[in-house]
Amino acid sequence: VLEVYYTSLRCRCVQESSVFIPRRFIDRIQILPRGNGCPRKEIIVWKKNKSIVCVDPQAEWIQRMMEVLRKRSSSTLPVPVFKRKIP
């Protein structure tokens, strides 16, 4: 599941990881664009083993994964503000 939406909360992530997470281990991804209280983009990944991690948005693997997910759903996602689940 991929979720992208704007939030009025402050930054959620206190530390970030660049370590690759295989797709089969991921349950949900949340993208929080910069702004509205947090000066940076945040990517939060829920793993199937009931753990959660903030991923460095600059990590190549997450950028590739996001691109694949965006292409898969580009025809259905509204712009610029959206919250969408992608199986």
């Epitope: 530390q15 949900r28 829920w46 009931k50 753990s51 959660i52 903030c54």
Partner: antibody
């Protein structure tokens, strides 16, 4: 307001089964990311994690006790349960239930019950 | 399993003292550590999460530090209300494991 409260038998004999109930309010175990865990503390000693149950009925157990533990939930009644079979005097402790919510920042066991004292004695 | 070795097991300090409690993990836990405070007869409450971040309502005299496998909780100037047991918890992987606890007493 999140609250949790444990209940149990108080006293039981060796070889019996300990049944504990955690009744909570202020959150739902049907909500994504929500879980309840059980932790125990023998008098004057440290904390020991026992088990977690999650919104999707995923369960995790302490392997040192796994074959004696069963965790379950009743989502509609806002309750979680722990059973420990074949108890011994070493199981005498205060038993706590605690909430965990998988959000960022992740703080496992952010809310705790008051604890219930369980004594195993012959 | 990840073992958490906490020291000291007990200590006595005077009001205003700087106090440090340490937890050492048997492997790198990547800051996935929480410090709990437990006052006599009460349930534990989280004080510091992800090794260095103060939970809501925690006085600024508390701080956390460390990385890798060694982590510390420091009280910069001890106050009487800080008399309590302190426990570390690693949540890097299951089974979650606590340190053995530190009993902090006031001289």
């Amino acid at each position: 307001q999140v609250t949790l409260k444990e209940s149990g038998p108080g006293i039981l004999q060796p070889s019996q089964t300990l049944s504990l109930t955690c009744t909570f309010s202020g959150f739902s175990l049907s909500t994504y990311g929500m879980g309840v865990g059980w932790i125990r503390q023998p008098s004057g000693k440290g904390l020991e994690w026992l088990a977690n149950i999650w919104w999707d009925d995923d369960k995790y157990y302490n392997p040192s006790l796994k074959n004696r533990l069963t965790i379950s939930k009743d989502t509609s009644n806002n309750q979680a349960f722990l059973k420990i079979t074949n108890v011994d005097t070493a199981d005498t402790a205060t038993y706590y239930c605690a909430r965990s919510e998988i959000v960022m920042p992740y703080v496992p066991f952010d809310y705790w019950g008051q604890g219930v004292m369980v004594t195993v004695s012959s | 399993d990840i073992q958490m070795t906490q020291s000291p097991s007990s200590m006595s300090a005077s009001l205003g003292d700087r106090v440090t409690i340490t937890c050492q993990a048997s492997q790198d836990i990547g800051n996935d550590l929480i410090w709990f405070q437990q006052k006599p007869g009460k349930s534990p409450r989280p004080m510091i999460y992800y090794a260095t971040n103060l939970a809501n309502g925690v006085p600024s005299r508390f701080s956390g530090s460390g990385s890798g496998s060694v982590y510390s909780l420091t009280i910069s100037s001890l106050e009487s209300e800080d008399m309590a047991d302190y426990h570390c918890l690693q949540f890097k992987q299951y089974p979650f494991t606590f340190g053995s606890g530190t009993k902090l007493e006031i001289k």
